[in-house]
């Protein structure tokens, strides 16, 4: 078996629109508690010239500010460069662009490297048909079942979305 | 625990190729993630690729990118580094490793390999 995931079949471009954060997984449980750095969420997505455009949603004093971050193309179909909180190798690890992404990534900042899983949806009433590939991703790369974060409606920021 | 055994090194012209493979005896292959990493003379060990336990997902250094490709097969408990293109900058004592989690950093992975020697000539 070869390492290699491709990018979604219609192109990332299917990517484009609202999500909705579901579940986050790290090794370094600091990283996804509230108000860690990747206690993130996703707000919508957009594709363009082949990198990934994301509106993200992050808490920040009782209040969630809505900042665009870019995740850069690379040589390599399913990875992404990300500059958040160091640099970050953004890995597309599951997609199907009309229910549900799983991505994770390497982050290194100055000289820790971790692990930070995230899995969205387009429709959070169908959030735990899709925990169980969350969970499968997360074992493949190490993360295990008790490193997993599923998140209620008030983490998400709900008030912030338009 | 899980005893490693490197083959397939040598010596290759610049722009060559080699495979490297790497067996495991142990009953955890299964459930560890998989490693290459290289020491070049008078250089520290450095990563040069990783794979999860089932295969499906790779991590490479940019510095082989595009030209080495990680892969395994766990029926066969055998992880394998296909080298393309080498470059002289490639010589190394290349080991094989395995650990818990996908990441590029050494302290990741609890066992190692002896190491098998590739040498690329200019």
């Known amino acids: 078996q070869e390492g290699n995931h491709e990018e979604p079949q219609g192109g990332l471009e299917e990517l484009s629109g609202r999500w909705h954060s579901v579940a986050l997984a790290s090794n370094k449980s600091d990283l996804i508690k509230p108000w860690g750095h990747f206690r993130v969420f996703i707000h919508s997505m957009s594709a363009k010239d082949g990198n990934l455009h994301g509106d993200i949603l992050i808490p920040q004093d009782g209040q969630c500010e809505k900042v665009s971050l870019t995740a850069f193309k690379t040589a390599t179909s399913n990875k992404f460069d990300l500059e958040y909180w160091g640099h970050n190798d953004l890995y597309l690890a599951e997609v199907d662009p009309k229910s549900y992404l799983i991505l994770y990534m390497i982050n290194q900042y100055n000289d820790d490297t971790s692990l930070v899983a995230h899995l969205m949806v387009r429709d959070l009433s169908r959030q735990q048909d899709f925990l169980p590939a969350f969970e499968s991703v997360c074992e493949d790369i190490g993360l295990h079942k008790d490193q997993i974060v599923v998140l209620s409606d008030d983490d998400r920021c709900q008030g912030s979305r338009d | 625990a899980v005893q490693l055994v490197e083959s397939g090194g040598g010596l290759v012209q610049a722009g060559g190729s080699l495979r490297l493979s790497c067996a495991a005896s142990?009953?955890?292959?299964?459930?560890?993630?998989m490693g290459w990493f290289r020491q070049a003379p008078g250089k520290e060990r450095e990563f040069v690729a990783a794979i999860s336990r089932s295969g499906a997902f790779a991590h490479y250094a940019e510095s082989v990118e595009g030209r080495f490709t990680i892969s395994r097969d766990n029926a066969k408990n055998t992880v394998y580094l296909q080298m393309n293109s080498l470059k002289p900058e490639d010589t190394a004592v290349y080991y094989c490793?395995?650990?818990?989690?996908?990441?590029?950093?050494?302290?990741?992975?609890?066992?190692w390999g002896q190491g098998t020697q590739v040498t690329v000539s200019s």
């Open positions: 142990g009953r955890t292959f299964n459930n560890s993630v």
């Open positions: 490793a395995a650990g818990a989690i996908l990441l590029p950093t050494e302290r990741r992975y609890d066992y």
